[in-house]
């Protein structure tokens, strides 16, 4: 039960994290105009990975995409790449983890296969989270550097948008979303890896013995965790050893229509 809960929670946390990484990547507020010198500006600038925006006090917002690839700073390109890699890995991880979830039955998939898939998705989530955290941190470092170098142009050549000495940029909301989302994805990945350990069958070479006891028949199976095939089978992962008796709450599993999809 604890393994299923850990796996399920890991999946949910990773799902939230990846949704956050996607949101952060799409957000326009990666850097926002520093209002320290002028808290009541009539023009507010903010920039994202894909476009820069200007919000006027009149309520009108104008956004312009960075319609160039070669003109963008290498660091910005690197951040874009890290975020996209994070999203792709996370999405694949989610897909893999759906099939690895213990509560979902797909054919007669062995627990060992589910364990491997859980580990794979866990690693993917960890790398995805690290990519997001790295991307956001690189951008944050870029901002800090530019903040103290008011004459340096952060986006030189970006469609004629040359930063003047007047406008300094500070951390935008997307950075915090990205950090939190990356952290959640990372935590989710770690939880999946922990869950994988509990899912992995402990190989013990016991001989299969079947005998008729007086009154009713009992089947014994080899191996560590009982191999299950049906929806109602051994949800508690009880270990069954030679000479042990089946407990009352265990259900004999029979092939069902759900086993062959």
């Amino acid at each position: 039960m604890a393994v299923t809960a850990c796996q399920g929670l890991g999946f949910v946390v990773s799902l939230i994290g990846i949704a956050g990484i996607i949101a952060a990547t799409c957000m326009d507020q990666w850097s926002t105009q520093d209002l320290y010198n002028n808290p009541v500006t009539a023009v507010f600038n903010y920039q994202g990975l894909w476009r820069s925006c200007v919000r006027e006090s009149s309520g009108f917002t104008e956004c312009r995409g960075y319609f160039t690839l070669l003109g963008l700073p290498a660091m910005l390109q690197a951040v874009r790449a890290l975020m996209i890699v994070g999203i792709v890995l996370g999405a694949i991880g989610l897909l893999v983890s759906i099939f690895a979830l213990k509560c979902i039955r797909i054919g007669s998939m062995e627990d060992s296969a589910k364990a491997n898939m859980t580990l794979t998705s866990g690693i993917m989530f960890i790398v995805s989270g690290l990519c997001a955290i790295a991307g956001v941190s690189v951008f944050a470092n870029m901002l800090v550097t530019n903040f103290w170098m008011s004459t340096a142009n952060m986006y030189t050549g970006m469609g004629g948008m040359v930063q003047t000495v007047q406008t300094r940029y500070t951390f935008g909301a997307a950075l915090f979303v990205g950090w939190v989302a990356g952290g959640l994805t990372l935590i989710g990945g770690v939880m999946m890896c922990i869950a994988c350990r509990g899912l992995a069958p402990e190989e013990t070479n016991y001989k299969a013995v079947s005998y008729h006891a007086s009154g009713h028949s009992v089947a014994y199976k080899p191996g560590g965790f009982k191999a299950s095939t049906g929806f109602g089978s051994n949800t508690k992962n009880k270990k069954i050893y030679d000479g042990g008796a089946r407990t009352e709450d265990e259900v004999q599993s029979y092939p069902s229509k759900h086993d062959y999809v």
């Epitope: 009539a42 023009v43 600038n45 009149s58 406008t167």
Partner: antibody, heavy 118, light 113 residues
Framework: EVQLVESGGGLVKPGGSLKLSCAAS????????IHWVRQAPEKGLEWVAY????????YYADTVKGRFTISRDNAKNTLFLQMTSLRSEDTAIYYC???????????WGQGTTLTVSS | DIVLTQSPSSLTVTAGEKVTMSCKSS????????????LTWYQQKVGQPPKLLIY???IRECGVPDRFTGSGSGTDFILTISSVQAEDLAVYYC?????????FGAGTKLELK
């Protein structure tokens, strides 16, 4: 046709109070920020106060801060300027002006005159 | 606060003449985000409220005759009337639209000889 009509001006003694109104029509009032701008006799224009479309942002000129209060009623398409502790230097024509793209006043009312005198 | 200095304070011209008036800002009104200059020009005739002429330093408002032209850098702005007409007699104000408090120049009064 966009129209802004100010009212409520008049003669007030120093230290007195008065409330100006600006009735708007011809545009979606709740979508735009509105300002009060004044002009003293034979003088230039002076910005007084601003209120955003949803009243979430309000700014005042230092000369009126703490004495004037700008507000709006979007349901009635009306802007208000509550003035207290009036001084002789507040004597002016008060205009309400619609704030538009480019941070410009694209439409102005005809103005209402406030005279502060003993 | 941004201070706008208009010059000359008054201009006496003849009809058909080309006129230029200046507006200098104590700070740059150029916004780096969109490369727009947040300076606006208004025309005010006697007994009337001001009328919007030009915003973003050079964009003519709808209905404004093309004889009115705005130009300038981040701090120095010019309003040009290519051929003055009798109906252009008014006071012209420039306005800082970049930061609060919003400020106006003292105005340039255009008179006919």
């Amino acid at each position: 046709e966009v129209q802004l009509v100010e009212s409520g001006g008049g003669l007030v003694k120093p230290g007195g109070s008065l409330k100006l109104s600006c009735a708007a029509s011809g545009f979606t009032f709740s979508d735009y920020g509105i300002h009060w701008v004044r002009q003293a006799p034979e003088k230039g224009l002076e910005w007084v106060a601003y209120i955003s479309s949803g009243s979430s942002t309000i700014y005042y000129a230092d000369t009126v801060k703490g004495r004037f209060t700008i507000s709006r009623d979007n349901a009635k398409n009306t802007l208000f300027l509550q003035m207290t502790s009036l001084r002789s230097e507040d004597t002016a024509i008060y205009y309400c002006a619609k704030w538009d793209r480019g941070n410009c006043f694209d439409y102005w009312g005809q103005g209402t005159t406030l005279t502060v005198s003993s | 606060d941004i201070v706008l200095t208009q010059s000359p304070s008054s201009l006496t011209v003849t009809a058909g003449e080309k006129v230029t008036m200046s507006c200098k800002s104590s700070q740059s009104l150029l916004n780096s985000g969109n490369q727009k200059k947040y300076l606006t020009w208004y025309q005010q005739k006697v007994g009337q409220p001001p009328k919007l002429l030009i915003y973003w330093a050079s964009i003519r408002e709808c209905g404004v005759p093309d004889r009115f032209t705005g130009s300038g850098s981040g701090t120095d702005f010019i309003l040009t009337i290519s051929s003055v007409q009798a109906e252009d007699l008014a006071v012209y104000y420039c306005q800082n639209a970049y930061s609060y408090p919003l400020t106006f120049g003292a105005g340039t009064k255009l008179e006919l000889k």
